[in-house]
């Protein structure tokens, strides 16, 4: 039932732009006067009962253009993809030649999106058609969830519980706000 199943328009990967580009630092914006005080959603730590660093979930970056029908984003965009299996961080193969994958005995854990964010995208269209403005859904961060017998998104169970949180919101990663940098995200990568 997750949004990944929603229709996703074609995208093209641009490897020559760098495999893991860093988003630009956040610029000043004029929204602060309406912001909730302490309005950021606190970071999600699904393993709070243990050492937070004990488990890891890989986040990969890709650069690509986003399309909507015949229209294509004016600039390539950078997106985050949750990848791989969850396990103790010390055993995840983050470097070439590093050992084997950790496989839990018992329930299976999967790296899936935790939070989402929006990015403005201006789409240029052929044939003199007017440009389009859209906001694309991006993965902001990943987390580990436990797979139950049923493997659809809605059945993924959290590691631990989350209490009520005041003022929804979190700046998941710095990004240019007023520059309106365009970003998009991969479907079915999880």
């Amino acid at each position: 039932q997750g949004w990944q199943a929603f229709k996703n328009d074609a995208t093209e990967i641009i490897p020559e732009l760098g495999e893991y580009p860093e988003p630009p630092p956040e610029l000043e914006n004029n929204k602060t006067m309406n912001r909730a005080e302490n309005g950021g959603r606190p970071p999600h730590h699904p393993f709070e009962t243990k050492d937070v660093s004990e488990y890891s979930c890989r986040e990969l970056h890709f650069t690509r253009y986003v399309t909507d029908g015949p229209c294509r984003s004016a600039k390539p965009v950078t997106e985050l993809v949750c990848s791989g299996q969850c396990g103790p961080a010390r055993l995840l193969p983050n470097a070439i030649g590093r050992g084997k994958w950790w496989r839990p005995s018992g329930p299976d854990f999967r790296c899936i999106p935790d939070r989402y964010r929006a990015q403005r995208v201006q789409l240029l269209c052929p044939g003199g058609e007017a440009p389009r403005a859209r906001k694309v859904r991006l993965v902001a961060s990943c987390k580990c969830k436990r797979l139950t017998r049923f493997h659809n998104q809605s059945e993924l169970k959290d590691f631990g519980t989350e209490a009520a949180r005041p003022q929804k919101g979190r700046k998941p990663r710095p990004r240019a706000r007023s520059a309106k940098a365009n970003q998009a995200e991969l479907e079915n990568a999880y």
């Epitope: 039932q1 949004w3 914006n29 929204k31 912001r35 309005g39 950021g40 990015q119 403005a133 906001k135």
Partner: antibody, heavy 121, light 110 residues
Framework: EVQLVQSGAEVKKPGASVKVSCKVS????????IHWVRQAPGKGLEWMGG????????IYAQKFQGRVTMTEDTSTDTAYMELSSLRSEDTAVYYC??????????????WGQGTLVTVSS | QAVVTQEPSLTVSPGGTVTLTCGSS?????????PYWFQQKPGQAPRTLIS???DKHSWTPARFSGSLLGGKAALTLSGAQPEDEAEYYC?????????FGGGTKLTVLG
């Protein structure tokens, strides 16, 4: 599909506070951007505030700044809107609305049934 | 805070065409205001017809279309039906802060 179910009607006295809930089903709250809109009897729609996924923050309409608090409980997928220092002109139907959790953000796609809040002494 | 203006009321004949507009006190409405259009009938919650200037939804009848027209957002109804009689609201995005227009009461004379 996203579905929103709101709490029942409330009658409050001036100066009191009201907390309206909005239960999300079909998706998890963390996948969605919840906004709150109100409509006084015979009047138009008025945006109160909501989650801006572009900046990852809750943003409130200036008119309600300091008087409204929007929170969430992700363990129950329920969003809340609390309005304090109520006055008679706050009598309205309060709606929660959310995006469709699609590839493109489209806000206000799904609406709760509305909660009538009556402020009367 | 910006003020969003709409025609208070408009009338159209069945089968006719009518255009509702949505202006901003801050200047011309552009695609970067991501204009939305909503339809609301008495006793019902609003429902979205158009998002992001011109993007229809699965439930939006084909006779509705969104555009920009002379510095305003526009909702055009071509081939009006009796069931289109309703209140129509536009909504503009001012960098994450939203403002509704005052609404247009559309009457379908029949």
């Amino acid at each position: 599909e996203v579905q929103l179910v709101q709490s029942g009607a409330e009658v409050k006295k001036p100066g009191a506070s009201v907390k309206v809930s909005c239960k999300v089903s079909g998706y998890t709250l963390s996948e969605l951007s919840i906004h709150w809109v109100r409509q006084a009897p015979g009047k138009g729609l008025e945006w109160m505030g909501g989650f801006d996924p572009e900046d990852g923050e809750t943003i409130y309409a200036q008119k309600f700044q300091g008087r409204v608090t929007m929170t969430e409980d992700t363990s129950t997928d329920t969003a809340y809107m609390e309005l304090s220092s109520l006055r008679s002109e706050d009598t309205a139907v309060y709606y929660c609305a959310t995006d469709s959790a699609g590839y493109w953000y489209k806000f206000f796609q799904h609406w709760g049934q509305g909660t009538l809040v009556t402020v009367s002494s | 805070q910006a003020v969003v203006t709409q025609e208070p009321s408009l009338t159209v004949s069945p089968g006719g065409t009518v255009t509702l507009t949505c202006g901003s006190s801050t200047g011309a409405v552009t695609i970067d205001h991501y204009p939305y259009w909503f339809q609301q009938k008495p006793g019902q919650a609003p429902r979205t017809l158009i998002s992001d200037t011109d993007d229809k939804h699965s439930w939006t009848p084909a006779r509705f279309s969104g555009s920009l027209l002379g510095g305003k957002a526009a909702l055009t109804l071509s081939g009006a039906q009796p069931e289109d009689e309703a209140e129509y609201y536009c909504l503009l995005d001012y960098g994450g802060s939203f403002v509704f227009g005052g609404g247009t009461k559309l009457t379908v004379l029949g």
